[in-house]
Structures are given as structure tokens and as C-alpha cells.
């Protein structure tokens, strides 16, 4: 449906409030270093222009594409060259190359100061003084730090953020009310950002077919009663939504997501029995709720897949006629029967099936060739099952912090060239799989664990892509999206690595460690652990444990001392010497 003015169309569909919020998110995700005030000014100018187009769609420039309008606006920023360097060259290009250029310069790890949470009273005063600016600042700060954050979902987070301040700033104990809510929003926000980053990586690095395969598997697990045609329609629409958001087309994305939620709710009888509550909610909550909805019950009677996909004499004929449709049906039928499998496992099985048909349908006796295809699935199924069992046992034995440390050592030995902050961040997140998934019954463990690990390993991949240092990481990240986790699991100690030279400065600590939160103190200790492994990759578990125990005792002792700084200086020297001796450095 062609509109004379795209900007007017989106303004009318979304309403002024959402329009302004989404433009702000879009601009902050592109120009991540620009000051808040500059972005607000740009957004206001775009909004005023949009209003003129709503009043008269034939007005000057109203027929221009959103990319042209937004790109032109971004290119008016005076400090573009000095702030962003070569990104300024994007402005010399024409659309659509200019937008592609901006997308390529999105930075997953921008050099921005850590967000420090002010005192509760300070935040509440700011909220009451100017609620609109306060909420815009939230959108801006999150968007610039997470340039692929799912924009319509960020509107939902902002709504919850506002609700938290509205409720808690008038509570008797503001801090007790507000801080847990902000912690929850922060943790959920990080998880949401990482999940969306994987979707965008899937689309951008592996293409639409890869994303669609993922969506078929996930939606078939979630909506096992829906027919294949219905799932296919949802997959097509969902792919469009995520392609738009990942491509910076946030207005179209939010609009199409709302349409998809509307369609799902209007057709819930043929999709899922679990949607009723979601569909009674307002738009932002509704879309979020649908995205998180639990799997529907499986239909009462599903036959064995063997009849259609192995025994039928038409397997090769059906495959040849429409390969992707036939494979899509295979994936749909398999996934709806297996909510206990991870999506990536289902995709591995489908890939194995595809490879087998490619080979066998060209053979003299195709049926004889592919008759035992499901035997090939067994090792693929058992590998993640065994891995999860072993790691959950280790997690239950060690607890989260020590389990993270075990992973830190494991991954530092696999890929010691990766920067220490990245290894710490990724290993800490990998370690969270324990508390997140091991509590589940076996039927829910694999989808929880392996699909979560895919999200975390994608963080490693996007951070590594910015400054590649390890061929092994590049290989695991680029060869196959669904085999990333098995690829990393299979890596052994990197025997080619030349140990880092010992630097006492790395292991010099000061009294400021005593005022850190427990989490920040853990990160300091884990940073030291990674550095130890980089110095001594062949160190045994026992050696590392001894050094880490000494380190913990040293921190505890000096934090209790009267003269903390002197203690850290003197005892620190002793600790370094003892550690060197223990590790044979």
C-alpha cells in the first residue's frame, strides 16, 4: 500500500509520542557519541517536519523515504568528522548505500562511561521536575549503548521504567521500592539486548533463510497446534519485523510489530490456546507477552515422522519440487513434537536431513540411502544432553561464582588471545546458564541452556569481530550459526599460544576494592584469574585454586586493616611473589 508520504503515514500510525521515541532511539543507535541535547534537537526538527506532512502530504520533501530524511538530518551534525572519523564519509553516499554505511559503523562496545545510578532522591527529583526529559534520557542512554536493541521492546521497558518511578517516588521507603525494580529492568534489558543482537547477527551474517529457519523451529515449538501454513505466515511477518529493526527502520518495525500482534490476537483460535491473557493487554505489553508466551500443549495425536519423511516413496519428489518448503515442513513437524530440544539442535537435525537428501536423492537407490537418516540424529541429540548434564552437575557442586571461574579458565585456555574484559564478561554470562537453566526439569533444560548459550556466544562473536585477534574465534563464529556452541565446546587448549609476560602491575590492588559491590569485587578477582591463565596457560586447577584462595584471603585481610593502602602495598608484594612461586613463573 503506497503512501504519498511515508513519514506522515508512520506518524499517524504510531502517534506523536511513539514516533518521537522511536526517532530518538534510531538516532542514538546511529550516532552513539552525540550529546543528548543534540539528539533531542534533531528529533524535534524531524517531528515538526512530520507534522507538516500530516497536514499536507504533498508538501515539499514529504515524499522522500525515511532513510533519506533521517540520513539527511544525521548528516547535518557539525561535529560528525571529529567525533566519528570515517563514519562521516557515509554522508557522501546516496541511499540506500548511505544507510548501509551507517549500519556498518554501529559499535557494539562504544567507548562510553559506565552508567552510574544516582541517589534515589536525586532520581525522583529529576523525574518530578521533568518527566518527559527524564524518560527520553533513559531511551537515549540505553539505545546508544545497545545499538541493536529491539526498538518497540525498548518502548515497553521505558513504560515500565516510568511506572516504577511513578509508584516508588511517592512510597514511604523510596529506595526499597525502586532499586529492585531498576535492577530487574537492567538485567532484563541486558538479556533482551543480547537476544536481539543474535537475531540481527543471524539476519546480517547468515541471511534471511537462516533467520526463517530459526523462526519456524521456535514458533512450531510455541504453537504446536497451528498448521504449517499459519506458522509460515507468522514466520514471514516476523522476519519482516526483525529485518526492519535490524536495518534501522524502526518506525516501520514498530508499526509492523503492532500489526503482527493484532493478527495473532484476531486469529488466536488457530494459533495457540495460551494467548488469551496476552491479547487482553495494551499494545506494548501485548507484543511483549506474545513474544514470551509459554509453549502450547502438543496436539493429542501426532504420528511418527518416518511415514512422510523416510518411508514415503515421494520423499525425493517432494524435496525436488520445493526444497525449502519440504525442509520447512520437516522442521515444523519435528519442532512441534520436540519442545524439549533447543532450537539450534532442531536446526542441526534439519541440516543433517537436508544433507542426506542432497546426497541420497542423486543415488541409485535413494530410499536405501536415506532409510537410516534418523540414526544420524542420535549423536546430535546426545551431545548437548550430555554436556548439559555434566555442566549442571558441576554448577550444583560449585555454585555460580566458582562455576564461572571454571568457565573462565576453560575459555581462556581455548582462546587466550581474546581481551581479558571480553573473556570475563562472556564467561560470567556463560556461567549464569547454571542458575538460569539447571533448576528446570530435564524436558526444559536443553532449550533453556543451549539457546541461551547461543545468545552469549554471539556476544563473544560480535565483540571479537570489532577487533579480531583469534582465528579460532573467527572460525567458530563464521562457519555455522547453529554449530557455534559445539565448535567452541570442541576447542582444546591453544598450544600455539605464547604466554603473556608477567606484569606485577596487573596484580597490584588498592584499597578502593574494599568499597566495591560484591559483583564488582568478583569481576576484579576474575580479571586476575584470566590474567594468571594467560601468564601460565598450563597451570593446573589446583595451582590456580591455591592462588585464588590466597588472593581472596589477601583482599579480606587488607579490607579489615586499619591502614588499608599500606596493607595492599606490602601484602600485595608478598602475594605476587607467592603466586609466582606457586605457578613457577
Amino acid at each position: 500500500d503506497a503512501h504519498k508520504s511515508e513519514v506522515a503515514h508512520r506518524f499517524k500510525d504510531l502517534g506523536e509520542e511513539n514516533f518521537k521515541a522511536l526517532v530518538l532511539i534510531a538516532f542514538a543507535q546511529y550516532l552513539q557519541q552525540c550529546p543528548f541535547e543534540d539528539h533531542v534537537k534533531l528529533v524535534n526538527e524531524v517531528t515538526e517536519f512530520a507534522k507538516t506532512c500530516v497536514a499536507d502530504e504533498s508538501a515539499e520533501n514529504c515524499d522522500k523515504s525515511l532513510h533519506t530524511l533521517f540520513g539527511d538530518k544525521l548528516c547535518t551534525v557539525a561535529t560528525l568528522r571529529e567525533t566519528y572519523g570515517e563514519m562521516a564519509d557515509c554522508c557522501a553516499k546516496q541511499e540506500p548505500e548511505r544507510n548501509e554505511c551507517f549500519l556498518q559503523h554501529k559499535d557494539d562496545n562504544p567507548n562510553l562511561p559506565r552508567l552510574v545510578r544516582p541517589e534515589v532522591d536525586v532520581m525522583c527529583t529529576a523525574f518530578h521536575d521533568n518527566e518527559e526529559t527524564f524518560l527520553k534520557k533513559y531511551l537515549y542512554e540505553i539505545a546508544r549503548r545497545h545499538p541493536y536493541f529491539y526498538a518497540p521492546e525498548l518502548l515497553f521497558f521505558a513504560k515500565r521504567y516510568k511506572a516504577a518511578f511513578t509508584e516508588c517516588c511517592q512510597a514511604a521507603d523510596k529506595a526499597a521500592c525502586l532499586l529492585p525494580k531498576l535492577d530487574e529492568l537492567r538485567d532484563e534489558g541486558k538479556a533482551s539486548s543480547a537476544k536481539q543482537r543474535l537475531k540481527c547477527a543471524s539476519l546480517q551474517k547468515f541471511g534471511e533463510r537462516a533467520f526463517k529457519a530459526w523462526a519456524v523451529a521456535r514458533l512450531s515449538q510455541r504453537f504446536p497446534k497451528a498448521e504449517f501454513a499459519e506458522v509460515s505466515k507468522l514466520v514471514t511477518d516476523l522476519t519482516k519485523v526483525h529485518t526492519e529493526c535490524c536495518h534501522g527502520d524502526l518506525l516501520e518495525c514498530a508499526d509492523d510489530r503492532a500489526d503482527l500482534a493484532k493478527y495473532i490476537c484476531e486469529n488466536q483460535d488457530s494459533i495457540s490456546s495460551k494467548l488469551k491473557e496476552c491479547c487482553e493487554k495494551p499494545l506494548l505489553e501485548k507484543s511483549h507477552c506474545i513474544a514470551e508466551v509459554e509453549n502450547d500443549e502438543m496436539p493429542a495425536d501426532l504420528p511418527s515422522l518416518a511415514a512422510d519423511f523416510v518411508e514415503s516413496k515421494d520423499v525425493c519428489k517432494n524435496y525436488a519440487e520445493a526444497k525449502d518448503v519440504f525442509l520447512g515442513m520437516f522442521l515444523y513437524e519435528y519442532a512441534r513434537r520436540h519442545p524439549d530440544y533447543s532450537v539450534v539442535l532442531l536446526l542441526r537435525l534439519a541440516k543433517t536431513y537436508e544433507t542426506t537428501l542432497e546426497k541420497c536423492c542423486a543415488a541409485a537407490d535413494p530410499h536405501e540411502c536415506y532409510a537410516k537418516v534418523f540414526d544420524e540424529f542420535k549423536p546430535l541429540v546426545e551431545e548437548p544432553q550430555n554436556l548439559i548434564k555434566q555442566n549442571c552437575e558441576l554448577f550444583e557442586q560449585l555454585g555460580e561464582y566458582k562455576f564461572q571461574n571454571a568457565l573462565l579458565v576453560r575459555y581462556t585456555k581455548k582462546v587466550p588471545q581474546v581481551s581479558t574484559p571480553t573473556l570475563v564478561e562472556v564467561s560470567r554470562n556463560l556461567g549464569k546458564v547454571g542458575s538460569k537453566c539447571c533448576k528446570h526439569p530435564e524436558a526444559k533444560r536443553m532449550p533453556c541452556a543451549e539457546d541461551y548459550l547461543s545468545v552469549v556466544l554471539n556476544q563473544l562473536c560480535v565483540l571479537h569481530e570489532k577487533t579480531p585477534v583469534s582465528d579460532r574465534v573467527t572460525k567458530c563464529c563464521t562457519e555455522s550459526l547453529v554449530n557455534r556452541r559445539p565448535c567452541f565446546s570442541a576447542l582444546e587448549v591453544d598450544e600455539t599460544y605464547v604466554p603473556k609476560e608477567f606484569n606485577a602491575e596487573t596484580f597490584t590492588f588498592h584499597a578502593d576494592i574494599c568499597t566495591l559491590s560484591e559483583k564488582e569485587r568478583q569481576i576484579k578477582k576474575q580479571t586476575a584469574l584470566v590474567e594468571l591463565v594467560k601468564h601460565k596457560p598450563k597451570a593446573t586447577k589446583e595451582q590456580l585454586k591455591a592462588v585464588m584462595d590466597d588472593f581472596a584471603a589477601f583482599v579480606e585481610k587488607c579490607c579489615k586493616a586499619d591502614d588499608k593502602e599500606t596493607c595492599f602495598a606490602e601484602e600485595g608484594k608478598k602475594l605476587v611473589a607467592a603466586s609466582q612461586a606457586a605457578l613457577g613463573l
Epitope: M298, A300, D301, L302, P303, S304, L305, A306, E333, Y334, R337, H338, P339, D340, Y341, F374, D375, F377, K378, V381, E382, E442, A443
Partner: nanobody, 124 residues
Framework: DVQLVESGGGVVQPGGSLRLSCAAS????????MGWFRRAPGKEREFVAA????????YYADSVKGRFTISRDNSKKTVYLQMNSLRPEDTALYYC?????????????????WGQGTLVTVSS
Amino acid sequence: DVQLVESGGGVVQPGGSLRLSCAASGSTISSYVMGWFRRAPGKEREFVAAISRSGGYTYYADSVKGRFTISRDNSKKTVYLQMNSLRPEDTALYYCAAGRYSAWYSQSYEYDYWGQGTLVTVSS
């Protein structure tokens, strides 16, 4: 969890019949695909027959098609294997299995719970 106990095995002459039963305790079986597998002396465990959750679909190994019939009574939490025209090569330990999620009924790795087995000997 489901506990499975097989019964009905025994010694029978070639051409004879036996009816095996598999009684479940613990959870209801209506949400499980139920299957029978067997292991002959010195051989690998092999699939025999399986039945879908409500009993609408059955699936058999080629070697038993037309001779064996699998059925279930969800209200009694029991699965049956009627074995006719028995042959010496049917001699094996017969196991009952339950799979919460099963796409390929013939694959042992898709079954979560297993009985201890009942012995069937076909001999003249």
C-alpha cells in the same frame, strides 16, 4: 515420573501367540508415546512397535508387520503387544518404553522411561 512393568512373557512354540502387557505407575500415560523394543541374545536392542498418545497411530518394524499388534488403554495405564505367528527369531527380552516427546517412534533415544523387560522364548 513413570515406572513401567512388563508381563506376559514365556515359552511358546513357533506359530503360537502371546500377549504382553506393560503397566505404568506414577504419571498418567496419555501424554506419552508408548513403544516396545526387544534385545535378542548377543544382538543390539531393536524397535518392535509404537503407538501414539491417544492410540490413533501405530508404527511397526518391518519384521513384525502383520503379525504383531500394539494397543493401549489409557484409563488402565496399560499398553499391550499382541504377538501372533511367532517365529524363533522373535526370541528376545521385550522392553516397554515411554517417550514424552517423540518424533521418530522407532528411535530408542526418543524414549525417557524403560521397563526391566519380559522374556519371550519361541522354541519347539
